[in-house]
């Protein structure tokens, strides 16, 4: 039994930590091998995470990790029964994937402006609740050339719009994504989208 | 809003025994590692005891054998508890939330050791 | 046990001047370990900088701190008001643990 492809590691700079790789055959991998790891800090111990399979040779664990800060790093054993498969360390600082945010709501009863809201995924006391950005995506159900992404670059999690630069009549849905440049993340998930009929008065054409 | 709320200080005998706590809220206590640290009358920062999330340990050789640290998740609190005090035990007494270094303080709890 | 000196003992300065305290440990320390805080009297510590250089949230930008090894610097570059109390430097080591250096109070001239 060997590794394939080493384990790669992604954190969400929280609590959880992603870890892939693959076999080079088939495997169970939840009976076959265990994943250890440990953060390099004087009050530490080990852990264990049994993987979950991910295509027939692929691996996954989802390691649940201390509160993180940027100067961690976890070292982390590959074992299959008593053979060290791999051995390797990990900085979740330089691998980060934010957590989606959440809670996402269209405000349509603002006078023909459209308020978008979500909700940021980390507590305050995260280092990356004040340095998330974010993109949201709004597309018509019935046009799939109507597709739009719009840059929130500034902190608060919400977004105006004029109901006019939409079309009048039809369902739009909406999604939003984030990232934190602080870091170099890559983006997160998107957030469940969510939908409304978006309506708004014609101003009167003069002649 | 992170919050860490010391008591159980005051005036003890040389030889005596204290309990301190920590109350601990607005994070979540059982993914960080918590310390206590002092600081005697008029002088600098000492560190005295960490406690791991796993309940692994450490102390300052001054209170070894002496003090011992302890939490409860379930309460969020954490705890010191101070056996066989010298009159150099006294000292402001903060509990911190950090790793390799503290960004969270209490505004501590005093400790006097004075027959 | 790595032992943290700090330099000088006081500072005298007037408000508006440049404030450069030092820090020397008796044994390298990873950058990564090295911190520094800020104590008014009466007042819990209060976190300025971690990993040898960068700034803890909310702290303001004259606060810097820099170096590697043994020798580490808090530098503030235009003193406030605020900004006259006692700073002390701190490092972690991974078989040692946790110790802080003696202090360097920054008073007003």
């Known amino acids: 039994m060997k590794v394939l492809q080493e384990p790669t590691c992604v954190s969400d700079y929280m609590s959880i930590s992603t870890c892939e790789w693959k076999m080079n055959g088939p495997t169970n991998c939840s009976t076959e091998l265990r994943l250890l790891y440990q953060l390099v800090f004087l009050l530490s111990e080990a852990h264990t995470c049994i993987p979950e399979n991910n295509g027939g040779a692929g691996c996954v664990c989802h390691l649940l990790m201390d509160d993180v800060v940027s100067a961690d790093n976890y070292t982390l054993d590959l074992w299959a029964g008593q053979q060290l498969l791999w051995k390797g360390s990990f900085k979740p600082s330089e691998h980060v994937k934010p957590r989606a945010p959440g809670n996402l709501t269209v405000h349509t009863n603002v006078s023909d402006t459209l308020l978008l809201t979500w909700s940021n995924p980390y507590p305050p006391d995260n280092y990356l609740y004040n340095h998330l950005t974010y993109a949201v995506n709004i597309w018509s159900e019935n046009d799939p050339a109507d597709f739009r992404i719009y840059n929130v670059t500034y902190l608060e999690p919400s977004l105006r719009i004029a109901a006019s630069t939409l079309k009048s009549g039809i369902s739009y849905r909406a999604r939003v994504r984030a990232w934190a440049q602080c870091y170099n993340t890559t983006w997160s998930e998107w957030s469940p989208s969510t939908k409304w009929h978006n309506s708004y008065r014609e101003p009167f054409e003069q002649h | 809003e992170v919050q860490l709320v010391e008591s159980g200080g005051g005036l003890v005998q040389p030889g005596g025994s204290l309990r301190l706590s920590c109350a601990a809220s607005?994070?979540?206590?059982?993914?960080?590692?918590m310390f206590w640290v002092r600081q005697a009358p008029g002088k600098g920062l000492e560190w005295v005891s960490g406690i791991g999330t796993g309940g692994a340990t450490s102390y300052a050789d001054s209170v070894k054998g002496r003090f011992t640290i302890s939490r409860d998740n379930a309460k969020n609190s954490l705890y010191l508890q101070m056996n066989s005090l010298r009159a150099e035990d006294t000292a402001v007494y903060y509990c911190a939330r950090g790793r390799y270094y503290f960004p969270w303080w209490g505004q501590g709890t005093l400790v006097t050791v004075s027959s | 046990e790595i032992v943290l000196t700090q330099s000088p003992g006081t500072l005298s300065l007037s408000p508006g001047e440049r404030a450069t305290l030092s820090c020397r440990a008796s044994q390298s320390v990873s950058n990564s370990y090295l911190a520094w805080y800020q104590q008014k009297p009466g007042q819990a510590p209060r976190l300025l900088i971690y990993?040898?250089?960068s700034r803890a949230p909310g702290i303001p930008d004259r606060f810097s701190g820099s170096g590697s090894g043994t020798d580490f610097t808090l530098t503030i570059s235009r003193l406030e008001p605020e900004d006259f109390a006692v700073y002390y430097c701190q490092q972690y080591d991974h078989s040692a643990g946790w110790t802080f250096g003696q202090g360097t109070k920054v008073e007003i001239k």
């Open positions: 990993g040898a250089s």
């Open positions: 607005g994070f979540t206590f059982s993914r960080n590692a």
